[in-house]
């Protein structure tokens, strides 16, 4: 049975691990290229070397492969507050991260933005800031949590969720309003 040439995974599984099937001759298994290199020419025949070349500056391959081109190195996104943790090498992509006292918020699987860790002013740190999660704050009495900041109950409108947390304060405000009308 001739494997479907369009399906790389199926083609590779015909050969032992670390080898791939020659695209023009499915009876030949060629050795894959090491990480940090790419496929320049397929092996001419069984037991003969694959012609692999090292990735050029600005590109990499992180695992053994038979790619015709190395992958372009990622760039850290300044507009998202990202900084370079380690630069790209021939066998490893750029590693981007955030500065000290910042955390990553993932907008999607491969896009993150750096934000400052909350300081929990008018509250206490319940859970410390982590690489991918902001500080979790618990607010002092008279304050409620809004977008991970402790906000004074004087800013609590009756329609908001904060009414439960700020109930005594709201009652007090209501009480002073009542007494002012007499």
């Amino acid at each position: 049975l001739v494997p479907h040439l369009g399906d790389r995974e199926k083609r590779d599984s015909v050969c032992p691990q670390g080898k791939y099937i020659h695209p023009q001759n499915n009876s030949i298994c060629c050795t894959k290229c090491h990480k940090g290199t790419y496929l320049y020419n397929d092996c001419p025949g069984p037991g003969q070397d694959t012609d692999c070349r090292e990735c050029e500056s600005g590109s990499f391959t992180a695992s053994e492969n038979h790619l015709r081109h190395c992958l372009s190195c990622s760039k850290c996104r300044k507009e998202m507050g990202q900084v370079e943790i380690s630069s790209c090498t021939v066998d490893r992509d750029t590693v981007c991260g955030c500065r000290k006292n910042q955390y990553r918020h993932y907008w999607s699987e491969n896009l993150f933005q750096c934000f400052n860790c909350s300081l929990c002013l008018n509250g206490t740190v319940h859970l410390s800031c982590q690489e991918k999660q902001n500080t979790v704050c618990t607010c002092h009495a008279g304050f409620f949590l809004r977008e991970n900041e402790c906000v004074s109950c004087s800013n609590c409108k009756k329609s908001l969720e904060c009414t439960k947390l700020c109930l005594p304060q709201i009652e007090n405000v209501k009480g002073t309003e009542d007494s002012g009308t007499t």
């Epitope: 300044k78 934000f115 977008e147 991970n148």
Partner: nanobody
Framework: EVQLLESGGGLVQPGGSLRLSCAAS????????MVWVRQAPGKGLEWVSH????????YYADSVKGRFIISRDNSKNTLYLQMYSLRAEDTAVYYC????????????WGQGTLVTVSS
């Protein structure tokens, strides 16, 4: 007062094109990276694309890469999204927004423009 006003949405056939615009006012547009996000019916917000202050660095979600182009004209205070080879799954309300700074929430975004891709 910050205002973002999207336009250019409409009904288009699969494979068709549209150009969305977002007119900005009430802030220094040239100082802010800008974002396009979308919300398909019954789904959450999806980050589509963003662009830096000067229009040099751009980002595209994998689902739109090679089909959409984000751009901006700082002299006109306008953000654009050129959409090609539209698919049914691109049907959504498209919003422009200022890239958040203080935390992972959109403080400023428009009312949205509906893009419907259907034959």
């Amino acid at each position: 007062e910050v205002q973002l006003l999207e336009s250019g949405g409409g009904l288009v056939q699969p494979g068709g094109s549209l150009r969305l615009s977002c007119a900005a006012s009430g802030f220094t547009f040239a100082h802010e990276p800008m974002v396009w996000v979308r919300q398909a019916p019954g789904k959450g917000l999806e980050w589509v694309s963003h662009i830096d202050r000067v229009g040099q660095d751009t980002y595209y979600a994998d689902s739109v890469k090679g089909r959409f182009i984000i751009s901006r004209d700082n002299s006109k205070n306008t953000l654009y999204l050129q959409m090609y080879s539209l698919r049914a799954e691109d049907t959504a309300v498209y919003y422009c927004a200022i890239l958040p700074k203080r935390g992972p929430r959109f403080d400023y975004w428009g009312q949205g423009t509906l893009v419907t891709v259907s034959s």
